[in-house]
């Protein structure tokens, strides 16, 4: 009391910092700093994010919490995970929907859109792979259907349908009947 | 938004006291420090004194230390300043401000007068 | 204590003119250290805090830089209502000290 010599950061414990004459402890995520710390190694005033605001990290000079995001509709996104004081929205595509990048050097924070998956059974295809961060991924056509062209086309039921050479290989056991 | 306003200026002789309040509003006045701070006529600023929100920590230029003394009450949004054994070189205009560090905020001011 | 030596004490200058103060600390301060206006019978007023740092709803022609021992405060295009003493000012360490201003006058 009464002295003039502002301590320098000894505090106890790691989470303090040096903001105007003292050494405060920061607040912590999900929390904004109001006022910082009035004495040595005191703790600053920090209040709750409002709603649809967050701080991710503890911190020491954020006055004010980061806006949610909002998925963008136009680009089919929804919320996986509302936001939180703590975490920001976490957007991403429906079941049967992919991630389309927007930009060739995709990474986390990147612009998106969804895009619907291919559904294998509705070109009569075998699904290889499931679709999630990309798209479905088919195989070869389905049993009673043969390659012709670019799509999968069904057996024919009698003699009558022609036949050419895939189809035959394919479907041959149905020329029996 | 923000408002100090000091009173308790006047003239005074050597030797004699005065007590100088600043009323704060607007504001969360127990979350913040604050300070005096004083200017004497056609001089510069000097930094006088600072008080923690809970007022449990003071600080003092040496040219006042002993003399005079600051105090709050956070019932009253109040923040006071008690001056002693004024001398003829406490002349001056006295803020108080808010802050510890930067003084975001600043009173207009009340004149305070040692003359004999 | 901590000095703080601004410079010059005073100067004149055109309107659109390009102006620049500095302050000199007795020892290193970091970036702790705030720029204030006052003009004449008011209370300063806060322009910049940690040397750089713009106050809300200050003009941007305002601007400060520096670090350690060396700062500089400048106005990048100078108005009628620019008239004022600037003062710095040191909050790394107590006692806070100021700089003895520099006064301001138009040519």
């Known amino acids: 009391q009464g002295g003039t010599r502002s301590p320098r950061c000894d505090c106890a414990g790691d989470f303090h910092k040096k903001i105007g004459l003292f050494c405060c402890r920061g607040c912590p995520a999900g929390h904004y700093l109001k006022a910082p710390c009035t004495e040595p190694c005191g703790n600053s005033t920090c209040l709750v994010c409002p709603q649809d605001t967050f701080l991710a990290w503890e911190n020491h000079h954020n006055s004010e919490c980061a806006r949610c995001q909002a998925c963008d509709e136009q680009a089919s996104q929804v919320a996986l995970e509302n936001c939180s004081a703590v975490a920001d929205t976490r957007c991403g595509c429906k079941p049967g929907w992919f991630v389309e990048c927007q930009v060739s050097q995709c990474v986390s924070s990147s612009p998106f859109y969804c895009q619907p998956c291919l559904d294998c059974g509705a070109l009569h295809r075998h699904t290889r792979l499931l679709c999630s961060r990309r798209d479905t991924d088919c195989g070869t056509c389905l049993p009673g259907f043969y390659e012709h062209g670019d799509g999968c086309v069904s057996c024919p039921t009698s003699t009558l349908g022609s036949c050419p050479e895939r189809c035959a290989a394919v479907c041959g056991w149905r020329q029996m009947f | 938004e923000v408002q100090l306003v000091e009173s308790g200026g006047g003239s005074v002789q050597p030797g004699g006291s005065l007590r100088l309040s600043c009323a704060a509003s607007?504001?969360?006045?127990?979350?913040?420090?604050m300070n005096w701070i004083r200017q004497a006529p056609g001089k510069g600023l000097e930094w006088i004194t600072y008080?923690?929100?809970?007022?449990?920590?003071?600080y003092y230029a040496d040219s006042v230390k002993g003399r005079f003394t600051i105090s709050r009450d956070n019932a009253k949004n109040s923040l006071y300043l008690q001056m002693n054994s004024l001398r003829a070189e406490d002349t001056a205009v006295y803020y108080c401000?808010?802050?510890?560090?930067?003084?975001?905020?600043w009173g207009q001011g009340t004149l305070v007068t040692v003359s004999s | 204590d901590i000095v703080m030596t601004q410079s010059p004490s005073s100067l004149s200058a055109s309107v659109g003119d390009r102006v620049t103060i500095t302050c000199q600390a007795s020892?290193?301060?970091?970036?702790?250290l705030s720029w204030y206006q006052q003009k004449p019978g008011k209370a300063p007023k806060l322009l910049i805090n940690?040397?750089?740092n713009l106050e809300t709803g200050v003009p941007s022609r305002f601007s400060g830089s520096g670090s350690g021992t060396d700062f500089t405060f400048t106005i990048s295009s100078l108005q009628p209502e620019d008239i004022a003493t600037y003062y710095c000012?040191?909050?790394?360490?107590?006692?806070?000290?100021f700089g003895q201003g520099t006064r301001l006058e138009i040519k």
């Open positions: 401000a808010r802050g510890q560090g930067p003084f975001e905020y």
């Open positions: 607007g504001f969360t006045f127990s979350s913040y420090g």
């Open positions: 008080i923690s929100s809970s007022g449990g920590h003071t």
């Open positions: 020892q290193d301060i970091s970036n702790y």
């Open positions: 940690d040397a750089s």
């Open positions: 000012q040191q909050y790394d360490n107590l006692p806070i000290t």
